[in-house]
Amino acid sequence: QNASRGRRQRRMHPNVSQGCQGGCATCSDYNGCLSCKPRLFFVLERIGMKQIGVCLSSCPSGYYGTRYPDINKCTKCKVDCDTCFNKNFCTKCKSGFYLHLGKCLDSCPEGLEANNHTMECVSIVHCEASEWSPWSPCMKKGKTCGFKRGTETRVRDILQHPSAKGNLCPPTSETRTCIVQRKKCSKGERGKKGRERKRKKLNKEERKETSSSSDSKGLESSIETPDQQENKERQQQQKRRARDKQQKSVSVSTVH
């Protein structure tokens, strides 16, 4: 395939030479290239009052190549087009025009939007989100124990971000209140407050030992027994029951 491309041989004239420069197959002293070597394009360049033939490996910007049996020519792209494969297939439009299916348009057709970065008409892309994850364990202050009412969360990913005219992304995180069967925290699970209570209890006992006259009623009353906590929660729960017939869902929007 890389053999010569079957060009018809021109009849030699007295001023036609075959010892040509720069890709010419035949040339003359006055007109430059008259024909080109295979895979080269013949272009006429105006120099002052005369036109000189030159052979180029590719057509200049704004031109496209057409093959003929005896010559490859460069032809101008359409007026609104900067780069093209042919007059009907533009690949880059001039400033102020948008490329769509090889054509240059001053505005994009219905259902498409202009991308001002690529200067193309592109499909409107709507946001796509994944399915929700399962609800997280019911938690309060980072713990899954030592309480009755907490919150649980579920999340989803954005699979496709929207284009300028596309539908916005929905929330990617959702939180709701939840109720669990109350369970005591094991030693390892105790949070900061549990440790503080323990420390206060120890201090109280130390004070008892060192100064029997020190009154520790105030301190003692600040520590509720599990039964007291349970009763208090039961009362609060009755008050809230009317409100809490349906679990409320609170959407935390972290739209991308």
């Epitope: 490996s57 590719s58 496209y64 057409t66 093959r67 780069t83 494969f85 007059k87 009907n88 090889g102």
Partner: antibody, heavy 117, light 111 residues
Framework: QVQLVQSGAEVKKPGASVKVSCKAS????????IHWVRQAPGQGLEWIGY????????GYNQKFKNRVTMTRDTSTSTAYMELSRLRSEDTAVYYC??????????WGQGTTLTVSS | DIVLTQSPASLAVSLGQRATITCKAS??????????MNWYQQKPGQPPKLLIY???NLESGIPARFSGSGSGTDFTLTINPVEAEDVATYYC?????????FGAGTKLELK
């Protein structure tokens, strides 16, 4: 002489991406656009898109627009075609070809892509 | 998109006989007097090979028994006389508009 040598066969899982290379020699790499065409088993030819090696500008068939990316490395005269979010229907032989004055005159030997779970 | 319809889908011809394959475009592939129609030959396990460009021009190195004709929407590839090495699938392809498209192919076999 002009030669286009493509990378070897690939086996991918659905949802994955593949990047096929096409190394050009025997001509000035930046002179002609490189196009990619695919052929599913026992099927016809389907144009995917093109890249101008001179400036990296590319254009794609609308069918592949959101999944394909074409790049090039002028220092090694190599063109690349990356296809993402693969599905079983993408199983095909992928060809690169030089585009000279509105026809594909030189072709790579083809790269077989199999997409299977 | 320009749809190219090739006929017949397959063709059995005796050695030395003429084979004719047609390609019909859903719209004209002509512009400024040029026809943007090409023909390719593909043998099993090989890439396509350019035979005819711009409807009727023979690619260099291709035997003269291959010829192309037509304009607008109707194009023909003729092989005369058919030789054993011509057993292959033949595709038409238009370069006039984005996206570039190919016909579905015509499989040539020997009778």
């Amino acid at each position: 002489q002009v030669q286009l040598v493509q990378s070897g066969a690939e086996v991918k899982k659905p949802g994955a991406s593949v990047k096929v290379s096409c190394k050009a020699s025997g001509y000035t790499f930046t002179d002609y656009s490189i196009h990619w065409v695919r052929q599913a088993p026992g099927q016809g030819l389907e144009w995917i898109g093109y890249i101008y090696p001179s400036n990296g500008d590319s254009g794609y068939n609308q069918k592949f627009k959101n999944r394909v990316t074409m790049t090039r490395d002028t220092s090694t005269s190599t063109a690349y075609m990356e296809l993402s979010r693969l599905r079983s229907e993408d199983t095909a032989v992928y060809y690169c070809a030089t585009y000279f004055a509105n026809n594909f005159d030189y072709w790579g030997q083809g790269t077989t892509l199999t997409v299977s779970s | 998109d320009i749809v190219l319809t090739q006929s017949p889908a397959s063709l059995a011809v005796s050695l030395g006989q003429r084979a004719t394959i047609t390609c019909k475009a859903s719209q004209s592939v002509d512009y400024d007097g040029d026809s943007y129609m090409n023909w390719y030959q593909q043998k099993p396990g090989q890439p396509p090979k350019l035979l005819i460009y711009a409807a009727s021009n023979l690619e260099s190195g291709i035997p003269a028994r291959f010829s192309g004709s037509g304009s607008g929407t109707d194009f023909t590839l003729t092989i005369n006389p058919v030789e054993a090495e011509d057993v292959a699938t033949y595709y038409c392809q238009q370069s006039n508009e984005d996206p570039l498209t190919f016909g579905a192919g015509t499989k040539l076999e020997l009778k």
